[in-house]
């Protein structure tokens, strides 16, 4: 049974040319996080954070994305095209997969950055990779 909840930075805005931190947090479960995938609105992957192997930033974003803080992601040199949805997908054992959503609006004007922290509905599915279960350590 999946008992966890994903908290995210929710709806955020940031200035064009600036930076923003995308952050998700999994709570209310003892499940071990094995991998976190960060995806953009068009389902293109930005980065992977594997609990055992570390970070991988996808080449298309290598100059604009920095890993962290924590399991989060820092998106730099923002453009108007960065406006849209971002998803964090937590692969866990034994729970399965949790997914969080963040909406980023990139603003032309100098509107102050703000963020709202709130809980969102989760999407889950059973974990099927039994061979993974012996290899995970919690980060």
């Amino acid at each position: 049974m999946m008992t966890g909840t994903i908290e995210t930075t929710g709806n955020i805005s940031a200035k064009k040319g600036g930076s923003v931190i995308l952050q998700c947090h999994l709570s209310s479960t003892m499940a071990q996080v094995t991998q976190v995938n960060w995806e953009q609105h068009d389902h293109s992957l930005l980065a992977i954070r594997n609990a055992e192997l570390g970070w991988h930033i996808y080449p298309a974003f290598k100059d604009r994305v920095a890993p962290g803080p924590g399991l989060g992601l820092t998106l730099q040199s923002l453009t108007m095209n960065d406006t849209g949805e971002y998803f964090c997908t937590y692969h866990t054992y034994p729970d399965g997969t949790y997914r969080g959503r963040i909406f980023l609006e990139v603003l032309e004007s100098s509107v102050a950055e703000h963020s709202a922290r709130f809980q969102i509905p989760i999407e889950g599915r059973d974990y099927k990779d039994d061979d993974d279960k012996h290899h995970h350590h919690h980060h």
Epitope: Q35, N37, L53, G54, P59, K62, D129, D131, D132, H135
Partner: antibody
Framework: EVQLVESGGGLVKPGGSLRLSCAAS????????MSWVRQAPGKGLEWVGR??????????DYAAPVKGRFTISRDDSKNTLYLQMNSLKTEDTAVYYC????????????WGQGTLVTVSS | SYELTQPPSMSVSPGQTASITCSGD??????ACWYQQKPGQSPVLVIY???KRPSGIPERFSGSNSGNTATLTISGTQAMDESDYYC?????????FGGGTKLTVL
Amino acid sequence: EVQLVESGGGLVKPGGSLRLSCAASGFTFSYAWMSWVRQAPGKGLEWVGRIKSKTNGGTTDYAAPVKGRFTISRDDSKNTLYLQMNSLKTEDTAVYYCTTDPLYDILTGLWGQGTLVTVSS
Amino acid sequence: SYELTQPPSMSVSPGQTASITCSGDKLGDKYACWYQQKPGQSPVLVIYQDSKRPSGIPERFSGSNSGNTATLTISGTQAMDESDYYCQAWDSSTVVFGGGTKLTVL
């Protein structure tokens, strides 16, 4: 010890089939993106295709010359990568290597010793 | 289809710097990797993700990648560096190798 060991190579007639295996040890195989690379005698390296980890969809990508004829699969419970080769042509003759894709600072750039596939009548 | 171009061969004197180039359309948007291969042996990764060096690879190997060109630089080249060198363009949908450069240490 961290290693990749290929097997299953041999002599096959044009139009025939062969399945190569790559046994991984010493690391968590299920996390790795794995590729097959081949090298024809006296020629350069040629990427054949790859399979992503299940946590990245487990999807496959192939080079144009083998698309539709070759199939890459993995069995994470056996720490094994496979290359099913069908409708083989003489130009498929090569040493076939399995490798880990260079994603992470750990577990990057591992290569097996290779296995020779000869397609000849 | 995507192609990478390398010089087929080049030579360098011991102790000098060798720079092997690899060109491809918008190669800087992908990751460039470099492999060293000696006769009868499996390739060895010497540079990955443009400029990172795997453990065990000497500091004299360095890499860069921007625009349409990736470069492998070997500073203070040694006789043992005589090999074939292959560049590789890597992204999440495809992988391509260059034709290889035979480096001779005179």
